[in-house]
C-alpha cells in the first residue's frame, strides 16, 4: 500500500527485502522545533518520545578499534521521556547498565529535556514528511552500501534494551551518502506500535506506518560516537517504514524468530549474521533527507536522517510478533516505542527525486515550494 495520497503510479516497487510501497512521495513537515516530549493530544503519535535504542544506544562508539574503550550508544545517558498524556505509554525504560543518567521512558516522567537538555533543541527528530514541500535535490545520489551482506559467522548480538530491540553490527559495514560523506554502520533497531496502532517514528503527511527500522552510522571523520554527538553529520541514520504485506519477509524473520528468546528486558541472544541490506528497501535512489537528532535521549542534534521513499513489507504475523513479544521494565509490554514528531522550525526536507510532482492526487498543479540547499554536497 502506499502512503496516504501517494501517487498510484509512483514507482514504488517491491525491493529485495520484500518492500513494496515507497513512501508516498510526500514531503517532510518542514517545521521541527523544540522537541515535544509528548505527542500533542489527539495525534497519532501515541508515545510521546523517541526510543532509539540504536540511537541512544549507539553501538560500539568506535568501530575502528574495538579494543579502545569505544563508547557504546547504550553507554550514552538516557532519559525518560514524557509521553503522550493520552496514550498510556509502555514505560519502556532501561537502566543503562547502572548509569545514573540512564533513566528515561516513553510517556512519563521525567521529561526528556530534564534528562538531556538537547531533547528541547530546535532541530529534533522525528518529523512529519510532506513530500509536496520537499526540495528536490538532484545532487542527492543513490546511497552506497558496502559490506552489508554479512556471513552467518560470526554471530551478532540481538538485545532487548528495554526500549527497543537492537542488533549490534560488526566493523566493516560502510555507507556513503555521497562523495566524501562516508559512514560506518554501528547498530540497527526498530520502533513499533501495538495491536491496531502504528508505531513508526517519522510520518508522511501525518500518516504513521506500522513500524520503522533505523540503521545508525558513525561518520568516518570520527573515531568515537561521543566525539560525533552533536556535530553536524557526525551520525547518520537510514530509516525505512515497515508495512503489512501478503508474504513473510525472510530477512526480517531471521530476527523476529528470535524475539521470544529476548522477551525479558535486558536479555540478549546471538543470531547468525545476515544480509543487513535486505532489511532495507531495494531502491537506494529515492529518499528524503534532513538534519535532525537522535530520537531518544540524549537527543543529540546534527544527525543526518535519510528516510527511504520505498517501504519494506512484512506479513501481518511478523508485525504482530514485533509488537507483541518483548517486555520492558515494570512488567509492561515494550510497545509504542516512538517519539512524537517534532517541529521542523524552518528546516527543509530534501528529496533525491521530485517528490512534490504528481505525488498527490489532490494537487492538481503541484508546485515545489522549497529549493535544494545542498546541491553538490
Amino acid at each position: 500500500q502506499r502512503l496516504p495520497r501517494m501517487q498510484e503510479d509512483s514507482p514504488l516497487g517491491g525491493g529485495s527485502s520484500g518492500e513494496d510501497d515507497p513512501l508516498g512521495e510526500e514531503d517532510l513537515p518542514s517545521e521541527e522545533d523544540s522537541p515535544r516530549e509528548e505527542d500533542p493530544p489527539g495525534e497519532e503519535d501515541l508515545p510521546g518520545e523517541e526510543d532509539l535504542p540504536g540511537e541512544e544506544d549507539l553501538p560500539e562508539v568506535k568501530p575502528k578499534s574495538e579494543e579502545e574503550g569505544s563508547l557504546k550508544l547504550e553507554d550514552l545517558p538516557t532519559v525518560e521521556a514524557p509521553g503522550d498524556p493520552q496514550e498510556p505509554q509502555n514505560n519502556a525504560h532501561r537502566d543503562k547498565e547502572g548509569d545514573d543518567q540512564s533513566h528515561w521512558r516513553y510517556g512519563g516522567d521525567p521529561p526528556w529535556p530534564r534528562v538531556s537538555p538537547a531533547c528541547a533543541g530546535r532541530f529534533q527528530s522525528p518529523v512529519d514528511i510532506r513530500p509536496q514541500l520537499a526540495a528536490f535535490c538532484p545532487a542527492l545520489r543513490p546511497l552506497e552500501l558496502l559490506g552489508f551482506q554479512l556471513p552467518p559467522l560470526p554471530e551478532l548480538r540481538l538485545r532487548n534494551n528495554g526500549h527497543s530491540v537492537q542488533l549490534t553490527l560488526p566493523p566493516g559495514l560502510e555507507m556513503a551518502l555521497g562523495p566524501g560523506r562516508e559512514y560506518r554502520a554501528l547498530q540497527l533497531h526498530l520502533h513499533w506500535g501495538a495491536a491496531g496502532r502504528p508505531g513508526s517514528e517519522h510520518t508522511v503527511e501525518g500518516h504513521r506506518f506500522p513500524a520503522e527500522i533505523h540503521v545508525v552510522h558513525l561518520s568516518t571523520a570520527f573515531a568515537r560516537v561521543d566525539e560525533a554527538l552533536g556535530r553536524p553529520g557526525g551520525l547518520a541514520v537510514l530509516a525505512a517504514f515497515l508495512e503489512e504485506g501478503p508474504e513473510e519477509n525472510s530477512a526480517y524473520e531471521q530476527l523476529l524468530s528470535r524475539l521470544e528468546e529476548i522477551a525479558e528486558e535486558g536479555s540478549e541472544t546471538q543470531v547468525p549474521g545476515l544480509d543487513i541490506s535486505a532489511l532495507l528497501p531495494s531502491d537506494f535512489s529515492r529518499y528524503f533527507q534532513y538534519e535532525g537528532s537522535l530520537t531518544t535521549p540524549p537527543c543529540a542534534q546534527g544527525v543526518i536522517w535519510t528516510v527511504f521513499n520505498q517501504t519494506v513489507m512484512l506479513s501481518a504475523k511478523q508485525l504482530h510478533t514485533l509488537s507483541d513479544t518483548l517486555w520492558g521494565p515494570g512488567d509492561s509490554r515494550l510497545q509504542l516505542n516512538f517519539r512524537a514528531t517534532q517541529p521542523l522550525n524552518g528546516r527543509v526536507i530534501e528529496a533525491s527525486f521530485p517528490a512534490g510532482v504528481d505525488s498527490s492526487p489532490r494537487a492538481a498543479e503541484p508546485v515545489q515550494l522549497n529549493s535544494c540547499l545542498a546541491a553538490g554536497d
Partner: antibody, heavy 124, light 107 residues
Framework: QVQLVQSGGGLVQPGRSLRLSCTAS????????MHWVRQAPGKGLEWVGF??????????QYSASVKGRFTISRDDSKTIAYLQMNSLKTEDTAVYYC???????????????WGQGTLVTVSS | DIQMTQSPSSLSASVGDRVTITCHVS??????LSWYQQKPGKAPKLLIY???NLHTGVPSRFSGSGSGTDFTFTISSLQPEDIATYYC?????????FGQGTKLEIK
Amino acid sequence: QVQLVQSGGGLVQPGRSLRLSCTASGFTFTDYYMHWVRQAPGKGLEWVGFIRNKASGYTPQYSASVKGRFTISRDDSKTIAYLQMNSLKTEDTAVYYCVRGGHAGSNYWYFDVWGQGTLVTVSS
Amino acid sequence: DIQMTQSPSSLSASVGDRVTITCHVSQNINVWLSWYQQKPGKAPKLLIYQASNLHTGVPSRFSGSGSGTDFTFTISSLQPEDIATYYCQQGQSYPFTFGQGTKLEIK
C-alpha cells in the same frame, strides 16, 4: 589427528534419560562450536543443536523438536561435549553424531569433523 | 525454517558418467551451503562447503556451484567408491537443515 569419539548410547525406555559424550582431540576444542546431528533408522540427517564456545558465552541452540528436553553442554578442560537427553520419546530413536562446526575463523556452519555415531534406541 | 529440496531422491549411473544432483532452498542463503557424502553404516563426510569450495582431501571430480536458492553438486566421472547418499545442508541460519538425501547407485 583430528577426531571425535562418542560414547553413551544404548536402549532406554520412553520418558527416561540418557547422556551422550563426545571426546575431542587433535584440535583446539575451545575455538569451536560443537553440534549434535541425528539420523533416524533409514532416514535423513536432522540437526539437533549446538553449544557455542567460551568466547561466545557457551550458550546453546536447539531444534524445536528437542528444545526443553535435551541439554547440550561442554567441559573445555576435558575437551568433551555432552548431550543430555531427558523425557525421551520413541521418535528420538536414532544414531546421534557429535559434530565440529563453527570456528572463529569460518564464516558459516559447515560440519567438517564427525564422530562415529552412537545408536540411541527408545523403546519399552 | 529453511526447507531444502534435493532431486532426484535416487539415481543410477554407470562408472565414468557425469552425475548431477540439485538442491533447491526455500529462501536465499547466499552461498552458505555444504554437500556431504554418507556411506552405509558410516558417518557423513564433508565434500563441498560454501557452495563450491572443495574440502581438504576430497577428489577433484567432486564440485559444487550455485548461490541464492539453487545449487548443484556434480561428480564429473563417477567412480565405484562414490556409491553413497549425498546431502546438502544450509548453514545460513538455525535450525540448520539438510536435504532429504540423494541415493546414488551404480548401474
